[in-house]
């Protein structure tokens, strides 16, 4: 049968009938039901919500809808011996101590089980010491302060201001600096954007929030015991010591009212450059310790903390597939959250639920995808993607041979300027085509597409009359299955302004006043956004569901291989004595790329011609498309980092957030200048450029006529 | 539907030991722990502790510590709570209740139906 | 440990009476307050959790609330089959504690 006859509604009606379906008001509805209390993963309401979001999408019409459960290493504070951070006299007696909660936003005080600001998966300790502060701990603000200002972080507590790269990352190397603690804050320099009050009067930061989050180095693990395998009952569980990822030091977040009391009596160094500086009425002196006055004063820091396996429930639905049922296009964002959620994860979750609502609703009409749709409720995302990787790992083989493609759905915003989108090369047309068909929720873009205003708002930086559609990076639950499987992934969400509001994600992130009022109030009243963002989430999963031909091109994975190996070439340019002494050379890199680009274009006119009536040339064009993205993952992995297997992206090592090309090759370049062996450092180049020239040849290889 | 399967009334000596029996069914055994409470004579209710079956962890009453030893058997999802050194006013019904296994729970939810134990000499 | 008043011990009323029954905690415990109800020769059914919600197959004439460290389970209108023992329990702190109970009789 064709997709036509299987599904009784011609494809351009199925799409317009499925979008709309899709309505702002449920959005708005299901939003509020989501955020009412917290959802901590690992609690009787997390699992409480797992149960009625199975409960509803069974009643949506889905075919089957299951609570998978695995047993995993969450984190939480110890109820009865709260963590904080004084500053002691010479004495030990504690002068200041950083507030035990935050103040709960206007409507509910009286909600219990509000789990207060802490740094999940710290050890417990209680280091004390002089404080340096190390801006935003990045590999670039330790160089400057170990090399350039001969400052030695041995020994200190450091404290840094949370913004531009993944908190774990800040741990990892204030670790490798020698650290005995590390204190996060978050300045309002980048959490408080100007002209804005802070909550509840606007979405700003007040000086009481405090931004919670894991502080996890996984690199793609899962569950810190498991790596690899499902923590499921007959698991085989490491010890603790030899758990994944666990930082090794105390670490602990504070607001900036608190940060003030610590920044403000610094002493030792002033700030190396204006990069240093926040928004604080505080000199940003780096230390070590405080002032002279304050010079016997140390800081201590009180964690007490404790890791614990946990029982934790993802959601997964099932809308089988009328014609291909074995081929997976998989829908999924998180549950948990920190607090209340209103933005992360439930302005995604209330999103998917829509979209369960609408497939569902075409369902009980008659209809059914062409495709298999699975549609997944994560649990635990917060403490290290734990949900998602361990349903990825206990059903890998199947996901490795079916999986088509997997949309992400946390957070449906982080502003509302314009339209955000990080994706495999293979969805930009998909990505180009529907957003031409949907219309634009911004003021000035009325009766204009969204491709105009997202264009016209965030062009790409290569190619005009393009918008701008980002490398995938990870901290969120598409690393998996992209990272690892290699199964071809997307998000989309609404942005901020980056050119204008510098500030670090959104200033509430992650804090008590993440509430559904900030979203209601302040970021979409009318919810216009995000039910744009479910049209174009629940749009390309139509699409990728739905097509006769998977609507993946190629051609596209060509334009950025040249374009990432021109970058690192470029990189590796900065050395030339040594690659003549070493003889590197890209020629073979280059010569791959070029052999993709030349099979793509190839594959991609026989595309267009094949007789498509015919269901085994059919399946067997769409398993090449499907596949293509599959023969990007070595199966070694990368160096030290053996779930991230994807050649061509990989999060970057100095940012978990941040995507890298060519990441094996980037790693082995970066700060190469100061290797003690640069004859071993330039051959771990070359290596990484022959695994990276092989590894284009061989996906280019896959679109090649199979005989 | 959840049940909480309670064993039969007991008469003891003073001194002896009695051990209840809670079995489960209905849902997922490890996925919850199961608390008991008892209750003398026309008084009110008393919670003596809690075990969750999947860690193993034991939390009691400081009342009752040194005297009461809770257990479970995954394999047959039964709980068991002994009470030694019995006393007259242990005289009382014994109860189990479900709790959920996780760090924030909103307490019992399901009740057996009681256990009499009668401590006479 | 947490001590939890509850009042009154007993009270009388009849079919259609709106019915209300406190708690006082002797310390904050947010909202980690159930209501449980007991009958004669019955399991004990837990009707509220959370201090006011509701659990599944309870009937909308019960609700609870909270003024401070006071707690109030409230039955609309009293029903034949709403005759029994009603118990508090705070489950803020270990070792959990109830209240001592409030026997609902038919005047």
């Known amino acids: 049968k064709s997709s036509n006859e299987a599904t009784n509604i011609t494809p351009k009606h199925n799409m317009k009938a499925f979008l709309d379906e899709l309505k702002a008001e449920n959005i708005k509805k299901f939003l509020y039901n989501f955020t009412q209390i917290p959802h901590l993963a690992g609690t009787e309401q997390n699992f409480q919500l797992a149960k009625q979001i199975q409960s509803q999408w069974k009643e949506f019409g889905l075919d089957s809808v299951e609570l998978a459960h695995y047993d995993v290493l969450l984190s939480y504070p110890n109820k009865t011996h709260p963590n904080y951070i004084s500053i002691i006299n010479e004495d030990g007696n504690e002068i200041f101590n950083t507030s035990l909660f935050e103040p709960p936003p206007p409507g509910y005080e009286n909600v219990s089980d509000i789990v207060p600001p802490f740094s999940a998966f710290s050890p417990q300790g209680m280091p004390e010491g002089d404080l340096v502060y190390v801006n935003y701990a990045r590999t670039e603000d330790f160089f400057k302060l170990e090399r350039d200002m001969k400052i030695n972080c041995s020994g200190k507590i450091v404290i840094a201001r949370y913004g531009k790269v993944f908190r774990g990352n800040k741990v990892k190397n204030a670790q490798l600096a020698g650290a005995k603690g590390v204190i996060l804050y978050s300045d309002p320099a980048d959490y408080f954007a100007p002209g804005v009050k802070s909550y509840p009067d606007g979405w700003n930061l007040p000086g009481g929030g405090v931004q919670r989050g894991n502080i996890l180095n996984l690199n793609g693990a899962g569950d810190p015991l498991t790596p690899g395998y499902p923590a499921n009952e007959y698991a085989y569980r490491r010890g603790i010591a030899e758990a994944v990822g666990l930082p090794s030091i105390p670490v602990h977040p504070i607001g900036y009212y608190d940060a003030q009391k610590l920044l403000e009596k610094m002493g030792g160094s002033a700030p190396p450059d204006s990069s240093w500086r926040g928004s604080l009425k505080v000199p940003y002196n780096v230390g070590p310790g405080f002032t002279g006055n304050f010079s016997t004063q140390k800081v201590k820091m009180h964690i007490h903390s404790t890791n614990e396996v946990t029982r934790i429930y993802n959601v997964i639905g099932t809308l089988r597939g009328a014609v291909e049922p074995d081929r997976y296009v998989i829908l999924g964002g998180h549950r948990d959250s920190w607090v209340f959620g209103g933005i992360d994860p439930q302005s995604g979750a209330a999103v998917v639920h829509e979209i369960v609502r609408s497939f569902g609703t075409l369902k009980k009409e008659g209809w059914r995808p062409r495709r298999t749709i699975l549609f997944a409720s994560w649990d635990a995302e917060e403490f290290g993607l734990l949900g998602s990787t361990e349903w990825a790992e206990e059903n890998s083989r199947l996901l490795q041979e079916r999986g088509v493609a997997y949309i992400n759905a946390d957070s449906s915003i982080e502003g509302n300027y314009t339209l955000r989108v990080d994706c495999t090369p293979l969805m930009y047309s998909l990505v180009h085509n529907l957003t031409k068909e949907l219309k634009s929720p911004d003021e000035g873009f009325e009766g204009k597409s969204l491709y105009e205003s997202w264009t016209k708002k965030s062009p790409s930086p290569e190619f005009s009359g393009m918008p701008r559609i980002s490398k995938l990076g990870s901290g969120n639950d598409f690393e998996v299955f992209f990272q690892r499987l290699g199964i071809a992934s997307g998000r989309a969400r609404y942005t901020k302004n980056w050119e204008t509001n510098k500030f670090s994600g959104y200033p509430l992130y992650h804090s008590v006043y993440e509430t559904y009022e900030l979203v209601e109030k302040f970021y979409d009243p009318m919810f216009k956004y995000h039910l744009t963002v479910a049209q174009v989430r629940g749009g390309m999963v139509f699409e990728l569901a739905n097509s006769i031909v998977l609507p993946f091109d190629c051609r596209d994975y060509a334009v950025v291989l040249r374009k990432y190996a021109d970058k690192i070439y470029s990189i590796s340019m900065k050395h030339p004595q040594e690659m003549k002494t070493y003889s590197v050379s890209f020629d073979s890199l280059f010569s791959a790329v070029k052999n993709f680009t030349e099979i793509a274009s190839k594959f991609s006119e026989r595309l267009q011609d094949f007789d498509k009536s015919n269901p085994i040339v059919l399946r067997m064009m769409n398993d090449q498309l499907m596949f293509l993205e599959r023969a990007f993952i070595d199966p070694l992995g990368l160096p030290d980092r053996p779930f991230y297997r994807h050649v061509i992206y990989a999060p970057s090592s100095h940012n978990k957030y941040a995507g890298e090309s060519f990441p094996g090759i980037y790693d082995a370049l970066f700060d190469i200048e100061s290797k003690v062996d640069p004859s071993k450092a330039w051959g771990e180049v070359k290596r990484q450029i022959y695994v990276a020239a092989f590894t284009v040849q061989a996906a280019a290889e896959t679109l090649s006529e199979v005989a | 539907e959840v049940q909480l399967v309670q064993s039969g009334a007991e008469v003891k000596k003073p001194g002896a030991s009695v051990k209840v029996s809670c079995k489960a069914s209905g849902y997922t055994f490890t996925s919850y722990g199961i608390s008991w409470v008892r209750q003398a004579p026309g008084q009110g209710l008393e919670w003596m502790g809690e075990?969750?079956?999947?860690?193993?962890?034991?939390y009691y009453n400081e009342k009752f510590r040194g005297r009461v030893t809770l257990t479970a058997d995954k394999s047959t999802s039964t709980a068991y709570m002994e009470l030694r050194s019995l006393r007259s006013d242990d005289t009382a019904v014994y109860y189990c209740?479900?709790?959920?296994?996780?760090?924030?729970?909103?307490?019992?939810?399901?009740w057996g139906q009681g256990t009499t134990v009668t401590v006479s000499s | 440990d947490i001590q939890m008043t509850q009042s009154p011990s007993s009270l009388s009323a009849s079919v259609g009476d709106r019915v209300t029954i406190t708690c006082r905690a002797s310390?904050?415990?947010?909202?980690?307050l159930n209501w449980l109800q007991q009958k004669p020769g019955k399991a004990i059914k837990r009707l509220i959790y959370a201090t006011s919600s509701l659990d599944s197959g309870v009937p909308s004439r019960f609700s609870g609330s909270r003024s401070g460290t006071d707690y109030t389970l409230t039955i609309s209108s009293l029903q034949p089959e709403d005759f029994a023992t009603y118990y508090c329990?705070?489950?803020?702190?270990?070792?959990?504690?109830f209240g001592g109970g409030t026997k609902v009789e038919i005047k």
């Open positions: 310390q904050d415990i947010g909202s980690s």
């Open positions: 209740a479900r709790v959920f296994d996780g760090y924030y729970n909103y307490a019992m939810d399901y």
């Open positions: 329990l705070q489950y803020a702190s270990s070792p959990y504690t």
């Open positions: 075990i969750f079956p999947r860690r193993g962890n034991t």
